[in-house]
Interface confidence: low
């Protein structure tokens, strides 16, 4: 904490301006009126204060607003936002999307910090719902935020936001989330040519239906095993041996290493053994020759 000292003669700040960067920490504490700082917060961001000086300014605001800053101040925090703790932010009531955008802009290019996560949580709770503009904003700044949403919330995400999604942003998405995101991605990338389309859609294929996997198998995409292993089991099961071979291309050899894991294991159990043998990989567990194959999928769906 900065020691309380009298402001030297002639140093009392009349404006928040660049002259303040030459003030020592104790001079800032003594000579800058907190109310003046609050009303001219928009100027702080344009002044190259040191981190130590910013600590003093934050301290002054904390004293002025012990119950939490008003939105008029929050909107203009700029880099001072980086000095806030999650505990500070929990005291805020942020309702303006412009305020949210301004603060997210400060953190742009960095991973989502605990401060940002708390800010988003406060904002959404303050609004009472995750409306379309909020979602547009959050996915623009943090594509990875998608996987923290429920499938119901995800259904409100516009396909345009999908363009900003990187493969690693979907690492934490579960199948139910991908089930909602995949058709949006399919729509977003629909005008791309085959190879470019596959590169973009690949991360979302955990939500793809059988029909789309069959279509991809006709396009020489050479899906890697890591992607194949993330496909929905119910989407993979109806694929024929020939379709899987076309889908994986040269990566088909990787099936052997994965034969005990889903969805490969369950898929093998649904194939005729003589069809599996055509792959020459030594996959075992298929339906022996001469056995009748009954499709019980519809009966299961109805029961």
């Amino acid at each position: 904490e900065v020691e309380k000292t009298a402001c030297p003669s002639g140093k009392k700040a009349r404006e928040i301006d660049e002259s303040l960067i030459f003030y020592k920490k104790w001079e800032l504490e003594a000579c800058v009126d907190a109310a003046l700082l609050a009303t001219q917060m928009d100027r702080v961001n344009a002044i190259p204060f040191t981190y130590e000086q910013l600590d003093v300014l934050k301290h002054k605001l904390d004293e002025l607003y012990p119950q939490g800053y008003p939105e008029s101040v929050i909107q203009h925090l700029g880099y001072l936002f980086l000095k806030m703790s999650p505990e500070d932010i929990r005291k805020w009531n942020v309702t303006s999307l412009e305020t949210l955008k301004a603060l997210l802009e400060v953190n742009k290019g960095h991973e989502m910090s605990p401060q940002v996560a708390t800010l988003i949580d406060r904002f959404v709770k303050g609004r009472g719902q995750l409306d379309k503009d909020t979602l547009d904003t959050l996915t623009a700044f943090y594509p990875g935020y998608l996987c923290s949403l429920s499938p119901e919330e995800l259904s409100s995400v516009p396909p345009s936001s999908i363009w900003a999604v990187r493969p690693q942003d979907l690492d934490t998405c579960d199948p139910r989330q991908l089930d909602v995101l995949y058709p949006k991605a399919r729509l977003a990338f629909q005008n791309m040519n085959g190879s470019e389309y596959f590169v973009k859609i690949q991360s979302f294929l955990g939500g793809a239906p059988t029909e789309d996997l069959k279509a991809l198998s006709q396009q020489n995409v050479s899906m890697d095993l890591a992607t194949f292993m993330k496909l929905r089991t119910d989407a993979v099961l109806p694929l024929t041996v020939a379709e899987v071979q076309k889908l994986l291309g040269p990566h088909v050899e990787g099936l052997k290493a994965e034969e005990r894991h889903r969805p490969v294991r369950d898929w093998i159990l649904r194939q005729r053994q003589d069809d599996l043998d055509t792959l020459g990989l030594g996959l075992q567990g298929g339906i022996p020759n001469g056995y009748l194959v009954l499709d019980l999928s519809m009966q299961e769906a109805l029961s």
Partner: antibody
């Protein structure tokens, strides 16, 4: 051009169930969300529920919870809506509708079936 | 449960502009769609995502949505535009239709 073709008109007694089908012709629709809505004679549209592309997830309007079941038969490109414990006030034209070219966001219903009249009468 | 309100009827002369309103709590925070339905026919989507027109829908149909009100505007209304118009929005995992507005071209 894709069309959604629904099953024919049905007459049912109170307490019975009805199962209406909706089949896509001209293109596969296993990648699209399908809604069901109904319209009582001279009345407005009422949303009943939605089934997702794989058929593993459904959401029903609260009013129909416990009475409606939506299923999907992928090989035949057909979606079904079954409504049980029928009452005279369930007499309506039942529509299936697909969320297609307009985008999956907010699931606007851009392709509609021709409707199936279900009459509930003793 | 979420409710949408529409005027029961709107009358317009040929060539004039018809504005059909749809009101709901914070409707501007949601996406609104509009459907046209003629007697004995299935509904047809004319506007989605507040102001976007599906292919094949004439340019005279436009939409806006802010505050508590979404509006479907038909500019240069034609006789063939006479129909019922329904607004629709998505709220809390549920899809809600308005009661419909009958547009009469005088």
């Amino acid at each position: 051009e894709v069309q959604l073709v629904q099953s024919g008109a049905e007459v049912k007694e109170p307490g019975a169930s009805v199962k209406v089908s909706c089949k896509a012709s001209g293109d596969t629709f296993n990648r699209y969300y399908v809604h069901w809505a109904r319209q009582a004679p001279g009345q407005g549209l009422e949303w009943m529920g939605i089934i997702n592309p794989s058929g593993v997830s459904t959401t029903y309007a609260q009013k129909f919870q416990g009475r409606v079941t939506m299923t999907r038969d992928t090989p035949t490109n057909t979606v079904y809506m079954e409504l049980g414990s029928l009452r005279p006030e369930d007499t309506a034209v039942y529509f299936c509708a697909e969320s297609r070219g307009s985008g999956y966001n907010y699931f606007a219903m851009d392709v509609w079936g021709q409707g199936t009249l279900v009459t509930v009468s003793s | 449960s979420y409710e949408l309100t529409q005027p029961p009827s709107v009358s317009v002369s040929p060539g004039q502009t018809a504005d059909i309103t749809c009101s709901g709590d914070k409707l501007g925070d949601k996406y609104a769609s509009w459907y046209q339905q003629k007697p004995g026919q299935s509904p047809v989507l004319v506007i989605y995502q507040d102001n976007r027109r599906p292919s094949g829908i004439p340019e005279r149909f436009s939409g806006s949505n802010s505050g508590n009100t979404a509006t479907l505007t038909i500019s240069g209304t034609q006789a063939m535009d006479e129909a019922d118009y329904y607004c629709q929005a998505w709220d809390s995992d549920t899809y809600v239709f308005g009661p419909g507005t009958k547009v009469t071209v005088l």
